[in-house]
């Protein structure tokens, strides 16, 4: 029967008939830097290529006996999630591996930086098709590892990594804490976060998505036809680098930014119990687990968005944090969140030729997140239109005035500590969805883009009575660009995107002593282009 | 040529200490430092801790990805190396696990 | 182009031992081990094993119940197979083949048993 | 180990499509996705047709194609040649070793 693992990853209508993608990621050459790999195991010959590079630090202690099945048993195990022939994700997938990991499974960071210039210089010698890099391991946050990860992805190379098996924030590590590596978390058959020991999965923002990691079968370098049980998140990881090298073989053109879009679009969605993460962390963490995409055509015609959160800004006064896309994403809509409620807000703003998300603290506050939506958008030309606090009773309103802009977002932004509550109309006059309305006091920012076939609406949904949490989510076929909260007033902790649902937050109703009059009503802005569903449409 | 002036080279190291390898160095270089730059620098880092007595060994020299080389030295030499021309920051070596 | 070269025939008393060798050429020596495998005249192909370039590690059919030895020599990416106590229904062409997917094969070495 | 089951023989005219059949149990073909099947003409050694079940190496025809359904594999060779006339073994990964196929002989009238 198939592993618990790989039917996880299998798109439901498949499972019936054992699907197996045509090309199983032979287009792909997938790299491992991991413990050396007993690359002739029945499970993996002739799909591993072991390269002439090692840099690993001496084993520690004078007792430390080198058995060779012992020196392997990561790497393989992890050859065979990748490309195993029986109890593989991508078995047509050819893997080149790196010796960075010694025989205890440590390395150094300088080992892996050298490692990763060899990929490089291996990619500029002989350029083949696309590459995934699979980095199963983790130390502590390394500034230099994180900043050749990102030049090697500015190269066009995917790279996937293990979250990390420490119960921690992922943030904290490298090269987990990455921006441009995709990082992965590990998820049990119950859909689960893995406990390892006392420890387990890593968690947080700079977690990109969850994959099977618990009791997950694969090649045991024991013997040549072994198979052992592992955990972690390096198993994790190398799931996603098998279901990496199976889209980029069906659509060898992918960019990085397309393919992390494409890997969260095709999820599993809020299946993971998220009371197994600390309280803090909850918000922060996707509730994704990896999947296989149902066809092995793109999805071409899709608007593909995810939510990038900030680190957090700390609790000064003037403290701000900042949410970045990434640089072939467009920021369509910027939010905050405080967990104590007070902040001043957010807005987009021009940093480095690129739009930015900044979300204000504000005094007394704890601190505050910026979040970014940010979207796979071609030919987008996209600006912000400001409009200053209004002063009068109806509130701030700005809309998009140039021809063919259409509304993705809307952001508010205060320099009061406290709004007070000014309750503005909730519903837009007739004709005129390209606006963002707001509080009186604040100044109002509209997220306008310009995009082939780009055509947007606002949904909205109100409660009268005060809620902790109120939701609006987007119809099927359209994609949630922006998310807001109306009032603004300091009672609402702030608004963010889950998938295709917006998220309005509320202070405890019960220690706020709030009045009916504060009712709140969550603003989406959903999304879709014609444009990317007719060329996709052409294609078949 | 001295370090530009008003950008200061910084040093970074592992916050977890058991994780930390003092005595080896990763030096990372500006952006567009090429190879050759990166190869003179490191001369000059091992000539300069020469004169103070103490010994270096360039380990690696980077190019590709990142310019910069990889030494090992003394961590009293920090300060110095931190001073030479075109260094961005010096980040000390640390583990990595298998996961 | 990927090779396997075998040695040549051999011709064995009852009670003696064979040793067999396989010259492999125009791969990753290390990615594949080799198979051995035999075939008794006028009969079907049977698997005698498997042996590794990479770590020397063998494993045999249950049927050889320790008359055979498979060995490697990286240096010489050789591969050998010894067969012990010979007997008459050990006739037949041995062949050693790439890997467990046995997808190249050597041109077979014809072992004649007979007192 | 048992040797997989395959008829002792079967044949077909030229232009004709034939199937061999191969029959083991879920702990040898029903088991894995590595099914392979073997070509030998008199006197050479066997070459691989098929491996993993339905892959074909390169420079194999695509007259040959493999299939598989529950712990019985299939070749099928479509517009038979005179050149097809071979003996033809299957072959299946067990959880530790091998096991090939009795061998069914093909002849093209």
């Known amino acids: 029967s198939i592993p618990w693992n790989l039917e996880r990853i299998t798109p439901p209508r498949y499972r019936a008939d054992e699907y197996q993608p045509p090309d199983g990621g032979s287009l792909v050459e997938v790299y491992l830097l991991d413990t050396s790999i007993q690359s002739d195991h029945r499970e993996i010959e002739g799909r591993v290529m072991v390269t002439d590079f090692e840099n690993v630090p001496e084993e520690d202690g004078t007792r430390f006996h080198r058995q060779a099945s012992k020196c392997d048993s990561h790497g393989t195990h992890l050859a065979g999630v990748v490309s195993g022939r029986d109890a593989g994700v991508a078995k047509g997938a050819s893997m080149r591996s790196l010796r960075v990991l010694n025989c205890q499974g440590k390395g150094t960071v300088s080992g892996t930086l050298i490692g990763l210039e060899f990929i490089r210089k291996s990619q500029l010698v002989q350029p083949v098709g696309p590459l995934v890099v699979l980095l199963p391991l983790a130390g502590g946050y390394s500034r230099v590892l994180n900043a050749a990860c990102q030049r090697l992805a500015r190269a066009g190379v995917v790279l996937v990594t293990a979250a990390g098996n420490f119960r921690d924030d992922a943030c904290l590590y490298s090269p987990a804490s990455a921006p441009e590596v995709i990082t992965v978390g590990a998820t049990n058959a119950q859909d689960q976060p893995v406990t390892l020991g006392t420890l387990g999965t890593n968690f947080g923002r700079c977690v990109d998505l969850f994959a099977p990691g618990e009791d997950i079968i694969g090649a045991s370098s024991d013997c040549s036809t072994c198979f052992v049980s592992q955990s972690g998140t390096s198993q994790a990881a190398a799931h996603v680098a098998g279901i990496a090298a199976m889209m980029l073989s069906a659509e060898p053109e992918l960019t990085l930014a397309e393919l992390r879009q494409r890997l969260i679009h095709f999820s599993a969605k809020d299946v993971i119990n998220e009371a197994w993460f600390p309280e803090d962390q909850r918000v922060l963490t996707p509730n994704l687990v990896a999947a296989l995409p149902p066809s092995t055509h793109g999805a071409g015609w899709q608007l593909f968005c995810r939510t990038v959160w900030s680190a957090h800004s700390g609790p000064t006064r003037m403290a701000t944090a900042i949410a970045r896309c990434a640089p072939d994403e467009e920021l369509l809509s910027c939010s905050s969140f405080s967990r104590s409620g007070k902040r001043r807000g957010e807005r987009m703003e021009a940093q480095g030729g690129k739009l930015v998300c900044r979300a204000h603290n504000a005094f007394g506050g704890e601190g505050v997140y910026a979040i970014a939506r940010c979207c796979l958008l071609p030919q987008a030309n996209c600006s912000v239109h400001t409009a200053p606090p209004a002063e009068a009773s109806m509130g701030t309103r700005v809309h998009c005035h140039q021809q063919g802009h259409v509304l993705t977002g809307c952001s508010s932004h205060w320099e009061v500590e406290d709004l007070g509550t000014h309750k503005p109309p909730v519903l837009r006059p007739r004709g005129q969805p390209n606006q963002c309305v707001g509080h009186r006091e604040a100044s109002i920012h509209a997220s306008c883009c310009h995009a082939p076939g780009l055509e947007c609406k606002v949904k909205e949904h109100g409660i009268p009575a005060p809620q902790e949490q109120v939701t609006v989510a987007c119809e099927e076929g359209w994609t949630l660009t922006g998310c807001s909260a109306l009032p603004g007033t300091s009672h609402v902790l702030g608004a963010y995107a889950v998938d295709n649902t917006c998220v309005v937050r509320s202070r405890d109703v019960s220690t706020t002593g709030s009045t009916s009059e504060e009712a709140v009503t969550a603003v989406a802005i959903c999304c879709r282009s014609r444009h990317l569903a007719q060329a996709s449409q052409e294609l078949q | 040529e001295a370090p530009e002036h008003g950008t200061t080279a910084t040093f970074h190291r592992c916050a977890k200490d058991p994780w930390r390898l003092p005595g080896t160095y990763v030096v990372v270089l500006k952006e567009e430092t090429h190879l050759s730059q990166s190869e003179r620098t490191a001369r000059r880092l091992q000539a300069q801790a020469a004169r103070r007595g103490y010994l270096t060994k360039i380990l690696h020299v980077f190019h590709g990805l990142l310019p910069g080389f990889l030494v090992k030295m003394s961590g009293d030499l920090l300060e110095l190396a931190l001073k030479l021309p075109h260094v961005d920051y010096i980040e000390e070596d640390s583990s990595v696990f298998a996961q | 182009q990927v090779q396997l070269v075998q040695s040549g025939a051999e011709v064995k008393k009852p009670g003696a031992s064979v040793k067999v060798s396989c010259k492999a050429s125009?791969?990753?020596?290390?990615?594949?081990?080799i198979s051995w495998v035999r075939q008794a005249p006028g009969q079907g192909l049977e698997w005698m094993g498997w042996?590794?370039?990479?770590?020397?590690?063998?494993n045999y059919a249950q049927k050889l119940q320790g008359r055979g030895t498979m060995t490697t020599d990286p240096s010489t990416s050789t591969a050998y197979m010894e067969l012990r106590s010979l007997r008459s229904d050990d006739t037949a062409v041995y062949y050693c083949?790439?890997?467990?997917?046995?997808?190249?094969w050597g041109q077979g070495t014809t072992v004649t048993v007979s007192s | 180990q048992s040797a997989l089951t395959q008829p002792a023989s079967v044949s077909g005219s030229p232009g004709q499509s034939i199937t061999i059949s191969c029959t083991g149990t879920?702990?040898?073909?029903?088991?894995?996705?590595?099914v392979s099947w073997y070509q030998q003409h008199p006197g050479k050694a066997p070459k691989l047709m098929i491996y993993?079940?339905?892959n074909r190496p390169s420079g194999v025809s695509n007259r040959f194609s493999g299939s598989k359904s529950g712990n019985t594999a299939s070749l099928t060779i479509s517009g038979l040649q005179a050149e097809d006339e071979a003996d033809y073994y299957c072959?299946?990964?067990?959880?530790?070793?091998?096991?090939f196929g009795g061998g069914t002989k093909l002849t093209v009238l």
């Open positions: 083949a790439r890997g467990y997917g046995m997808d190249v």
């Open positions: 125009g791969y990753t020596l290390t990615s594949y081990g």
């Open positions: 042996v590794s370039f990479y770590n020397g590690n063998t």
């Open positions: 879920s702990s040898d073909v029903g088991g894995y996705n590595s």
């Open positions: 993993e079940v339905s």
């Open positions: 072959n299946s990964y067990t959880s530790t070793s091998m096991v």
